[in-house]
Structures are given as structure tokens and as C-alpha cells.
Amino acid sequence: MMTGTIETTGNISAEKGGSIILQCHLSSTTAQVTQVNWEQQDQLLAICNADLGWHISPSFKDRVAPGPGLGLTLQSLTVNDTGEYFCIYHTYPDGTYTGRIFLEVLESSVAEHGARFQIP
């Protein structure tokens, strides 16, 4: 029975040209995490195998950095990076857990304006 839950950074926004950290955390299970995959819509960005470490897709290696931890850092953001990102935890013996993050990349002035009027 799968008892685990994935906590994510949820819906996040970032400035065009900046960077953002995508983070997920698996809790409430004793299952062994064997691999974490990071996907953007239908594309695989990177994998982190518990033993073999990180393997970044060549299509993204210039703008994706591993970590911190099992997270993923996206750099030199463009408006086209807006969309859904998924962390997929492959575990033993539970199986697969999936977390979702929605990233919105904003023009610099819009991001600054939004931050100024955020409700605490």
C-alpha cells in the first residue's frame, strides 16, 4: 500500500532571465527512493539515480543544474519555460509518486510589481 505523500513548492513565479529551484519532498513512507525524474510537460529534463547520481538531458544541460538535493535548478529562464513540471519518485517497494509544480515566468517589471503587492 502506498502511504507516502509528495510536498512541492506548488505554484511559483520567477523573472525572465533569472533562475528558480524546483523542489519536491517525499514523506510518510519508508520506501527506498531509487530514482527521481524531473519532467516538463512531455519532456524528460534530468534523472537522479540513488547510486549513479545525476544525468541531465543534453537538450537542457546548458540551462539546468542538479540540486540542491534531489531538486532541480532552472537557469536563464524564458517565458517559454512557463508550464507544469513534475517530480517523479521511483521507490521500492511502493512504486511511483508524482508531484506537480506550476512555474510562471514573468517579464521583470511584472514580477517586481507582483511581488510588491503580495499579501503576506
Epitope: 530514482q35 524528460l44 540513488a50 547510486d51 547520481g53
Partner: antibody, heavy 114, light 107 residues
Amino acid sequence: EVQLVESGGGLVQPGGSLRLSCAASGFTFSSYGMSWVRQAPGKGLELVATIKSSGGSTNLADSVKGRFTISRDNSKNTLYLQMNSLRAEDTAVYYCVRGYFDYWGQGTTVTVSS
Amino acid sequence: DIQMTQSPSSLSASVGDRVTITCRASQDIKTALAWYQQKPGQSPKLLIYWASTRQSGVPSRFSGSGSGTDFTLTISSLQPEDVATYYCQQYYSTPYTFGGGTKVEIK
């Protein structure tokens, strides 16, 4: 030049044990996860075991769990596979492999037969 | 576990021919696929990773394509030194699994 040299294979009776070694050179051994992959005679490839660069995490194929142990000594640049309770179906060439399978050793042959 | 199925299991072609080997995954593996070449009496050698990226030193006549469940390894102009068995491997999820291999011979 990356080199992976396996040793320790041989003929062993069913139920016996063997310890395979893989001497690595030409790269920073302690920075790479490592694997053992085997190939039964005339057959395909099977990933047997993997180990983290630091040695702190390992994974074994279901077919060898409880019988095989993978370990490493980063001070000696050496990877090991301890094989116990050997069965006829463990007969294969065993390859030592670096990281995401970019370099393979020449293999060492294990034959389990009475 | 993800099953990897290669076809054909063997083929014979003439020098200079275009050769295509296919690999099918039992579920979506995105582009987490590698191809290996194993010449007779030798250990496997990495040819292609991430479905389409050639490993350093691999001749340009080798190319990989595909995404999801269907993948292809193409040898644009078969050479005598390409006689080997070719394997695909998925690394989308553990345990990583290999296809059964495709043996390529020269007519």
C-alpha cells in the same frame, strides 16, 4: 585513458562463493557510481548491482538479492562483487561499468557447475 | 519492470546499406534510452544516450531517434566493422533493463 579491469572469475560449484574485483584507473573513481552487469552465455545483458560514489547506497537485482553484495574501496580504486550461494543460472561474464554505462571492462567469466 | 523489445533479432545487409534497428518500451520512457554495440568477443560500448546523442568518438553514420515507447538506431551506411550485436537500454526507472539484442551481419 579510462580502464576497468575485472578479476576473480572462475569455476565454482553450486552453493559456492566468489569475490570479483574491478581495478579502475584513468579517472577519479570516487566521483562515479559504479555497476556490475552480467551476460549469460549467448544471452543478453542484465544489470546486477549498482553502488553510489561514496559507497553509502547500493541496489541489487531481485535475482541476486540476499546472495550478492556490491562494495567499493575508494582508497584502492577498486569495486567488488561478493557472490554467495551461487547457482547454475549465475553463470555469465561479469562486467564492471562506470557511471551511466559509458565505460565497460573486458569482463570476467564465472562458471557455476558441479 | 519496463520490458524492452528489439526487432529484428538478427539481420543481414550489404556493405553500404542503410540499417534500421527498432526498440520498443512497454511504457513511456520519454528519451531515457541508450544504445550499445557489442562486437564478437568484446565488451559492450556505449553508442547513443538520451535517445539521440552520440557518444564521443562514435562515427556519424550511427544515429538514434525516438521518444516515448518507440526508438530507432540507424546505421546510414553499413561498414564491415559494424558487425556486432546492438542492445537498447532504458534508464527511465529502476531496475534499468536491456533489450534482447539485434545481431547485425554482412551479406
